[in-house]
Interface confidence: low
């Protein structure tokens, strides 16, 4: 039975086996086509989601589709129902929390009162001044909180208490990539992790431990990537994995926050990387213990310099490392998070690519998550 399952797939009507390598090869080998059903699926970037959250205290902004202008949401007459609508527009299904925060001196957008129409937020037509003088600070999910704060050092062994969102993504019980829990159903990782194996069946997620082999595996229902853009073959290195059953959150299993749309990190901003990847750039072996390291944002201009990536790093990517080299993600860390701590931890990057590991002029290159918020929200909405 185990050997059959490992090498063969059972087609229904009529019942017969096909070699497992024929799964997800683009050919309908089963009469009903079920061999092409549970495969990595692509999902287009989709329309602009008309709500977003700003790094200015997670304040809610709403798009006026007629003019293309964004407005900040006034707290006047804002209700729990409106909060739920806003979060549903971004694909969240959990219960949101919201509060009033005063309009600050750096507020650049007009502030308008919000109403609802056809399960979408709209601006109230006769919107007068925002009487409360307050904006809506909205949190769609409790995220980005860990039991333990890491110390600032080079590279050291990590505890799951510090990084409860880190998961191991495994194919046939072998660690392939890292990933981050975003909510009870969804894990964020890199699309290139699935280049070799596009069938969903054998992929599993392991959460809740800092040791590779020691925790139960979770079944995967769907793996979703963006449509491949041949003009930018390294772009769009992002994937979402939908779990078959929702996670139960605990001290060691928690979600990390998505970044804000305007999360522009300046060079030298401190960040963290974690993973079970190779411990030496020339091979070495996969680490059994989760490792963590502090790095920093490296300016894209520097990253694209003559002695570095020379233009290969696009606006949808970011670089991180340390100027003198020596601290970097490596093979096996792919898909894991590049993290920034403000009030909560945010996944600002996904371990994507680079040349060598830890070279001074070739730091790690990461998928810039803020560039894909619209896509993430559209995927979640489609799956609500």
């Amino acid at each position: 039975k185990v050997i059959l399952d490992k090498y063969y797939f059972l087609c229904g009507q009529p019942l017969h086996f096909i070699p497992r390598k024929q799964l997800c090869d683009g050919e309908l080998d089963c009469p009903l086509g079920e061999d092409e059903e549970h495969c990595v699926k692509s999902f287009p970037e989709g329309p602009a989601v008309a709500v977003r959250l700003s790094k200015d205290r997670s304040t809610l902004q709403v798009l006026d589709s007629a003019t293309g202008n964004w407005f900040s949401a006034c707290f006047d007459n804002f209700t729990e129902a409106l909060a739920e609508t806003a979060c549903r527009q971004m694909g969240y299904s959990s219960k949101p929390t919201f509060r009033a925060v005063e309009i600050g001196p750096d507020q650049d957008l007009d502030v308008v009162e919000i109403t609802e129409n056809s399960q979408e937020l709209r601006m109230r037509n006769s919107s007068g001044p925002c009487l409360s003088g307050s904006l809506v600070s909205l949190h769609c999910l409790a995220c980005g909180k860990s039991l333990k704060t890491p110390r600032v050092v080079g590279v050291e062994e990590a505890s799951v208490d510090s990084w409860p969102w880190q998961v191991s993504i495994q194919y046939d019980k072998q660690h392939v990539c890292g990933g981050s829990i975003l909510d009870p159903h969804w894990v964020l990782t890199a699309a290139h992790c699935f280049r070799k194996h596009t069938d969903v069946f054998n992929w599993k997620v392991r959460a809740g431990s800092d040791k590779l082999g020691s925790f139960p595996s979770l079944a995967v229902a769907k793996i979703i990537i963006i449509e491949f853009n041949p003009m930018y073959p390294k772009d769009n290195d992002i994937a979402l994995m939908k779990l078959q059953f929702p996670l139960t959150f605990s001290g060691t299993v928690r979600p990390i926050c998505l970044p804000f749309f305007d999360e522009e990190l300046t060079p030298a901003t401190p960040l963290w990387i974690i993973g079970w990847g190779f411990t030496k750039q020339n091979g070495g072996k996969m680490s059994d213990i989760l490792l963590q390291a502090s790095v920093q944002v490296i300016d894209s201009t520097r990253c694209n310099a003559d002695d570095a990536y020379q233009g290969e790093v696009t606006e949808k990517m970011m670089c991180a490392g340390i100027p003198e080299g020596g601290v970097d993600t490596c093979q096996g860390d792919s898909g894991g998070p590049l993290m920034y701590q403000s009030d909560q931890w945010h996944v600002v990057g996904i371990v994507s690519w680079g040349y060598g590991c830890g070279g001074p002029s070739t730091p790690g290159v990461y998928t810039k998550v803020s560039a894909y918020l619209n896509w993430i929200y559209n995927v979640w909405k489609a799956e609500l």
Epitope: M231, Q281, T301, A305, A308, Q310, G311, Y355, G356
Partner: antibody
Amino acid sequence: QVQLVQSGAEVKKPGASVKVSCKASGGTFSNYAISWVRQAPGQGLEWVGRINPNSGGTNYAQKFQGRVTMTRDTSTSTVYMELSSLRSEDTAVYYCARGRYSSSSWGQGTLVTVSS
Amino acid sequence: DIQMTQSPSSLSASVGDRVTITCRASQSINNYLNWYQQKPGKAPKLLIYAASSLQSGVPSRFSGSGSGTDFTLTISSLQPEDFATYYCQQSYSTKWTFGQGTKVEIK
């Protein structure tokens, strides 16, 4: 897929100069590092140099230093390689190739013949 | 400059054979090593980048391994369309260098 289209074949006399163009299409031109690689008849591949798409900065192989000049025109998404003081051993197919570390996109090649 | 030495310079093999080509760098280049295939009158085609990563669209019978100074390109089961010249190339240095090439001919 990025397309690189090169200018046509050239026949030059020794001592003359040649300027080969490489036009990119299918993406943001400023993202492309363009290398030039040549191949003499029956010989292997030889790297000539590279131009950084953002700064216009160049790296040249020691062998060609002083004889080669690479430039770019962002308005037409075109990169140029000019080789001066030509000699018969410069007879080769010259390729442009996109990428700083590896090249999945190459031009079709331009044959430069140096003959008196 | 970093020297790249490929061996053998040519080899004869039959369809279905396992073929191995090696490339040695004059100094450590980590995994900054690429393999290209070239057919007469055509531009080179990228097969393997960063020593072991298979370029999109390249058949899985091609594989690369190695790090530091010693690298290998393996064709697990030679196909008729694989008869060509293969080059290694280092990108560790800003100044690229190529191996001298290995011509794979029909036995």
